[in-house]
């Protein structure tokens, strides 16, 4: 059965300066390959977080993604600004050169409220 990417919330609202959690769970880790979060779609989409590397200043993983059986790829965005508004997608790739996108979550729209 094909892996499914589940983003349970269609939208979340967060006050500027606060943090928010974007939830994402997978039904399987197979086929092997990375999981990444993007804002937007198409050529102009922006990489927000990759579980293959560190150094995403305001974004952290919520659960321990180093567990070999981990299926929770939720992220927390801290100190949210109005520029963070948009629709965020959790995307599963199959390994390759380059990696191939095989499944995306339905997206979670982030609304940023003025403080």
């Amino acid at each position: 059965t094909e892996v499914k990417v589940i983003q349970p919330e269609k939208s979340v609202s967060v006050a500027a300066g606060d943090s928010t959690v974007l939830n994402c769970t997978l039904t399987s880790l197979l086929p092997v390959g990375p999981i990444r979060w993007y804002r937007g779609v198409g050529q102009s989409r922006q990489l927000i977080y990759s579980f293959t590397t560190e150094h995403f200043p305001r974004v952290t993983n919520v659960s321990d993604a180093t567990k070999r059986s981990n299926l929770d790829f939720s992220i927390r965005i801290s100190n949210v600004t109005p520029e963070d508004a948009g629709t965020y997608y959790c995307v599963k790739f199959q390994r390759g050169s380059p990696d191939t996108e095989i499944q995306s979550g339905g997206g979670t729209e982030v609304y940023v409220l003025a403080k």
Epitope: L30, T66, S69
Partner: antibody, heavy 118, light 107 residues
């Protein structure tokens, strides 16, 4: 620079126990899963056990399950391997290794030699 | 189990390919580890099929397809003489495995 330094090896008799340690530096230890790998004299590499970054999940090769225990102390940036009921077949150089995101290894320690002999 | 040739040899400057088979492309990632002498610390030359750590020379590269992985050394040097172990992580079983090692001799 990433550094992994094992200690605790030595000569023990069959049936005895030993605890190996691995001191990590040069990276955020609490963000990485870790593993122990050994190499018997004249043999290849054998993965023994792995542990998640937070320490809650552990994994073992069948041949050491119930006899070896992997653990970590993130406050001390240290990894451990407790080995019980040692036999001559456990004689090897024991390495600690840092795991990549997909549970391969990117950095290795210099190793510590364990000799089990009567 | 991962299978690799026991030995390969090459002249300096030649291209060397070492293959590793036995994994499942659907569930297994590969890496290559260099060991210059028995009991010395292994060095990772490739992980995640084709990713080279920053301190490893660009003559080392890797690829994977089907049930096999390949380590390629382009323009091999005398200092590349070592035993090369392929390693795999199986996302289905959560287990790491190694091949028996390939001894590279540079003539």
């Amino acid at each position: 620079d990433v550094q992994l330094v094992e200690s605790g090896g030595g000569v023990v008799r069959p049936g005895e126990s030993l605890r190996l340690s691995c001191a990590a530096s040069g990276f955020t230890f609490s963000s990485h899963a870790m593993s122990w790998v050994r190499q018997a004299p004249g043999k290849g590499l054998e993965w023994l056990a792995g542990i998640s970054a937070g320490g809650s999940d552990t994994y073992y090769i069948d041949s050491v399950k119930g006899r070896f225990t992997i653990s970590r102390d993130n406050s001390k940036s240290s990894l451990y391997l407790r080995m019980n009921s040692l036999t001559a077949e456990d004689t090897a150089v024991y390495y600690c290794a840092r795991e990549t995101w997909n549970h391969l290894f990117d950095y290795w320690g210099l190793g510590t030699l364990v000799t089990v002999s009567s | 189990a991962l299978t690799q040739p026991a030995s390969v040899s090459a002249n300096p400057g030649e291209t060397v390919k070492i293959t590793c088979s036995g994994g499942d492309y659907y569930s297994t990632y590969y890496a290559w580890y260099q060991q210059k002498s028995p009991g010395s610390a292994p060095v990772t030359v490739i992980h995640s099929d084709d990713e080279r750590p920053s301190d490893i020379p660009s003559r080392f590269s890797g690829s994977a397809s089907g049930s096999a992985a390949t380590l390629i050394i382009t323009g091999v040097r005398v200092e590349d003489e070592a035993v090369y172990f392929c390693g795999g992580y199986d996302g289905r079983t959560y287990i790491n495995t190694f091949g028996a090692g390939t001894t590279l001799t540079v003539l």
